[in-house]
Amino acid sequence: APVLPGEDSKDVAAPHSQPLTSSERIDKHIRYILDGISALRKETCNRSNMCESSKEALAENNLNLPKMAEKDGCFQSGFNEDTCLVKIITGLLEFEVYLEYLQNRFESSEEQARAVQMSTKVLIQFLQKKAKNLDAITTPEPTTNASLLTKLQAQNQWLQDMTTHLILRSFKEFLQSSLRALRQM
């Protein structure tokens, strides 16, 4: 199974002296997830032609995936570390249902999909420890997530392939924006 960052003492400088919320540890964790996403995207692109699909087809998909917007304070202009940290945690919590959907979508990369899901849960815990303004963080309703999952799994094959592609692409973009923003916190 893929090794989570920090599980191997060679992976982190002075592993025992670092708090779990340290900048380096969080950064390593995000990069680990991004590596996992790259592997999953590779399998998705090899399996279907979604990666070359037209933007029109992508725009037609009505998934409500978390996305960074100016008001979230995570971009260089209008950067706000408190607002942004809340957005990152909220967004990751919202992505969890989509990561659950991915679990049965891969054959050769099944372990990788599980590793992405598990390490995202750990990342959320790290960031929640870092966040002071926990009141502003809203957790998605379990019933809402369950019905969304059922709906996604009921789609036809083409839509499921498109959904998988969109989740991975959006999650990658979200994590890359998070990485840039967290650097200044």
């Epitope: 003492s9 060679k10 400088a13 708090p19 900048s23 540890r25 950064d27 570390e81 200044q184 916190m185």
Partner: antibody, heavy 118, light 109 residues
């Protein structure tokens, strides 16, 4: 053009205090974490402290922890370093620098000299 | 405490290629350490050359390049020039702090 201008250095006795300032221009100051780095005569640079973009988090090197306080005023585009209980080993040129990110490298000022001597 | 290690000195012939390294006393250097490289000539403030592993600072000649090779960060100067004779320092983010290496004195012979 990115500019960082340190001020407030000078001669101070051991046990004394000093407050350094760094005026920033040419970039979105409030979007960047900022650091103080010092360099003692004939030595290499030593990281002193960092403050997050919004000022909510501060970090210190072991040698200054409990004696120095970093702060910032984003409305004035200014970074500060309050130095208390100064020691001879704090003698150095103090530089302020932005934390690289958003496609911008880290820029350093020209520095301000702090001399701790009786 | 984790120590950032650099070669104390290095020499290179004009036009030659030299690679300076930056390691950790415990563990490997990764992109999450955001390796940075600085050049300092006598009487001058340090000048940033490379940030975030391999991003060249504005105004820095393209003969300077950064990378991570094996378990260390590296600064490569391709086609060294007389004005490259200087002290070179690397910096790594470790945990929540930044640590500088002891520096490499580069001589262009």
């Amino acid at each position: 053009e990115v500019q960082l201008l340190e001020s407030g250095g000078g001669l101070v006795q051991p046990g004394g205090s000093l407050r350094l300032s760094c005026a920033a221009s040419g970039f979105t100051f409030s979007s960047y974490a900022m650091s103080w780095v010092r360099q003692a005569p004939g030595k290499g640079p030593e990281w002193v402290s960092r403050i997050s973009a919004g000022g909510g988090s501060t970090y210190y090197g072991d040698s200054v922890k409990g004696r120095f306080t970093i702060s910032r005023d984003n409305s004035k585009n200014t970074l500060y370093l309050q130095m208390n209980s100064l020691r001879a080993e704090d003698t150095a040129v103090y530089y302020c620098a932005n934390r690289a990110g958003w496609g911008l490298g880290d820029y350093w000022g020209q520095g301000t000299l702090v001399t701790v001597s009786s | 405490q984790t120590v950032v290690t650099q070669e104390p000195s290095f020499s290179v012939s004009p036009g030659g290629t030299v690679t300076l390294t930056c390691g950790l006393s415990s563990g490997s250097v990764t992109a999450s350490n955001y390796p940075g490289w600085y050049q300092q000539t006598p009487g001058q403030a340090p000048r940033a050359l490379i940030y975030s592993t391999n991003d060249r600072h504005s105004g820095v000649p393209d003969r300077f390049s950064g990378s991570i090779s094996g378990n260390k960060a590296a600064l490569t100067i391709t086609g060294a020039q007389a004005e490259d004779e200087a002290d070179y320092y690397c910096a790594l983010d470790i945990g929540d702090i930044t640590e500088f290496g002891g520096g490499t004195q580069l001589t262009v012979l």
